[in-house]
C-alpha cells in the first residue's frame, strides 16, 4: 500500500480571503484617488468627462443592502477587467502628455491586475460559479487628439475611483454576511 493519505486540505477561511481582497481594493482606491488628483493638477478637467466604452457604475451606495456575494464579485471582476483594458490602452495610445503620469500609471495597472487575480482566487475558494470566458472586446479607437487622451484619462480614473469605492463598501458589507 502507498503512503497513508495526508490530512484533508483545509480551504482557507473565506473571511480572511475577503479581508485580503478588501485591503487590495482599498489600496488601489487610494492610489487611484491620488493619481486622479495628480492628473487634475497637470491637466485641469473642464467639467465631467465620459467614455462610452467604460462600464456604467455597478450600484448606488443606497442599494448596497440588496447585494449578494456571487453577483458582486462577478460584476466587479467584469468592470475591473474593462478598466484594466482601458488603462493599458491609455498607456499605449494616450500620447506623450500622459507619459508624465508614469510610472504611477504602470503601477496602477499592475495593482489592478493583481486585484483581478485575487478576485478570481476568491471566487474559486468560495466555490462560486466561474464566469464564462470574456468575449473578445472590440479594440478601443485611439484618441482623436492629445486633449482627447487627457479627457479619456480623466474619465477612466474617475470611473475607476467610483467603482473601487463601491467595491470596498460592498465587500465590507458582504463580509458581515459570511
Amino acid at each position: 500500500p502507498g503512503p497513508p493519505p495526508g490530512p484533508p486540505r483545509v480551504s482557507p477561511d473565506p473571511r480572511a480571503e475577503l479581508d485580503s481582497t478588501v485591503l487590495l481594493t482599498r489600496s488601489l482606491l487610494a492610489d487611484t484617488r491620488q493619481l486622479a488628483a495628480q492628473l487634475r493638477d497637470k491637466f485641469p478637467a473642464d467639467g465631467d468627462h465620459n467614455l462610452d466604452s467604460l462600464p456604467t457604475l455597478a450600484m448606488s451606495a443606497g442599494a448596497l443592502g440588496a447585494l449578494q456575494l456571487p453577483g458582486v464579485l462577478t460584476r466587479l471582476r467584469a468592470d475591473l477587467l474593462s478598466y484594466l483594458r482601458h488603462v493599458q490602452w491609455l498607456r499605449r495610445a494616450g500620447g506623450s502628455s500622459l507619459k508624465t503620469l508614469e510610472p504611477e500609471l504602470g503601477t496602477l495597472q499592475a495593482r489592478l491586475d493583481r486585484l483581478l487575480r485575487r478576485l478570481q482566487l476568491l471566487m474559486s475558494r468560495l466555490a462560486l460559479p466561474q464566469p464564462p470566458p470574456d468575449p473578445p472586446a472590440p479594440p478601443l479607437a485611439p484618441p482623436s487628439s492629445a486633449w482627447g487622451g487627457i479627457r479619456a484619462a480623466h474619465a477612466i480614473l474617475g470611473g475607476l475611483h467610483l467603482t473601487l469605492d463601491w467595491a470596498v463598501r460592498g465587500l465590507l458589507l458582504l463580509k458581515t454576511r459570511l
Epitope: A30, Q34, A37, R40, D41
Partner: antibody, heavy 120, light 108 residues
Framework: EVQLVESGGGLVQPGGSLRLSCAAS????????MHWVRQAPGKGLEWVAY????????YYADTVKGRFTISRDNAKNSLYLQMNSLRAEDTAVYYC?????????????WGQGTLVTVSS | EIVLTQSPATLSLSPGERATLSCSVS???????LHWYQQKPGQAPRLLIY???NRASGIPARFSGSGSGTDFTLTISSLEPEDFAVYYC?????????FGQGTKLEIK
C-alpha cells in the same frame, strides 16, 4: 532645512472670520501636497484640510466643510486657510503640515502652530 | 469615516522599561497607510513611524511599529526620559484622514 511658519491666529468672535498663513521654505513647495491639522486645548489632533500641489484637488473634514477654504500660492511658497462662520469649537492650535515624499507616508514636517480662539 | 482607537489612554512606566501602544482601526486598512506621531507639551507633533514599520528620519532604533488589517502596535524597546509624551496613530488611506485619540506615556 524644511521650515513651516504659521501666522494669522488670534481672538475672534463667534461668526467671525480669520485667515491663517503658512510660509514654507527649504524645499520645493510646488511639489508637495499640504495639510492643515488642528488641536483643541487639551485634546487630540484633528485633520482639517488638504490641497494638492497644483490646487486642483482639495479635501475637507466634514466639521469645516462649507466654512473653511484651503488655498496656496506656489509663487509665494505660501499655504492659506480662510476660516468663516467661526464657532467656539474651532478654538485650537492650527498646524500646517507637509506630506513626506509620497502621499502615503504621513505628515513629516509641521509648523509650530498658531492659536485661534473663538470667544465672545 | 475610519475610526482609530488607541489603548491604553495612559501608560505609566519607568525609564528602561518596554512600552507597547495599540491602535485599533474600525475598518481594514492596508498597512502602508498607518503612521505614528509623538507630541511633547507645547510642541508640534513629530512623525515617528510611517507605513506601519518605517522609522522617519532621525528616529532612534528603539522605536518600532508593526501590525496589519485592523490592529497596529508601536513599541519602544527601552524607554528613555525624553520618550514620555503623547503618541498618536493616523490613517491616510481614506478621506477624511483621521487620528487616534492618543496615548499618554507618563513616568511612573
Amino acid at each position: 532645512e524644511v521650515q513651516l511658519v504659521e501666522s494669522g491666529g488670534g481672538l475672534v468672535q463667534p461668526g467671525g472670520s480669520l485667515r491663517l498663513s503658512c510660509a514654507a521654505s527649504g524645499f520645493t513647495f510646488s511639489s508637495f501636497g499640504m495639510h492643515w491639522v488642528r488641536q483643541a486645548p487639551g485634546k487630540g489632533l484633528e485633520w482639517v484640510a488638504y490641497i494638492t500641489p497644483g490646487s486642483n484637488t482639495i479635501y475637507y473634514a466634514d466639521t469645516v466643510k462649507g466654512r473653511f477654504t484651503i488655498s496656496r500660492d506656489n509663487a509665494k511658497n505660501s499655504l492659506y486657510l480662510q476660516m468663516n462662520s467661526l464657532r467656539a469649537e474651532d478654538t485650537a492650535v492650527y498646524y500646517c503640515a507637509r506630506e513626506y515624499y509620497s502621499y502615503d507616508e504621513g505628515f513629516a514636517y509641521w509648523g509650530q502652530g498658531t492659536l485661534v480662539t473663538v470667544s465672545s | 469615516e475610519i475610526v482609530l482607537t488607541q489603548s491604553p489612554a495612559t501608560l505609566s512606566l519607568s525609564p528602561g522599561e518596554r512600552a507597547t501602544l495599540s491602535c485599533s482601526v474600525s475598518d481594514l486598512i492596508p498597512s502602508q497607510y498607518l503612521h505614528w506621531y509623538q507630541q511633547k507639551p507645547g510642541q508640534a507633533p513629530r512623525l515617528l513611524i510611517y507605513r506601519t514599520s518605517n522609522r522617519a528620519s532621525g528616529i532612534p532604533a528603539r522605536f518600532s511599529g508593526s501590525g496589519s488589517g485592523t490592529d497596529f502596535t508601536l513599541t519602544i524597546s527601552s524607554l528613555e526620559p525624553e520618550d514620555f509624551a503623547v503618541y498618536y496613530c493616523q490613517q491616510g488611506v481614506d478621506v477624511p484622514f483621521t487620528f487616534g485619540q492618543g496615548t499618554k506615556l507618563e513616568i511612573k
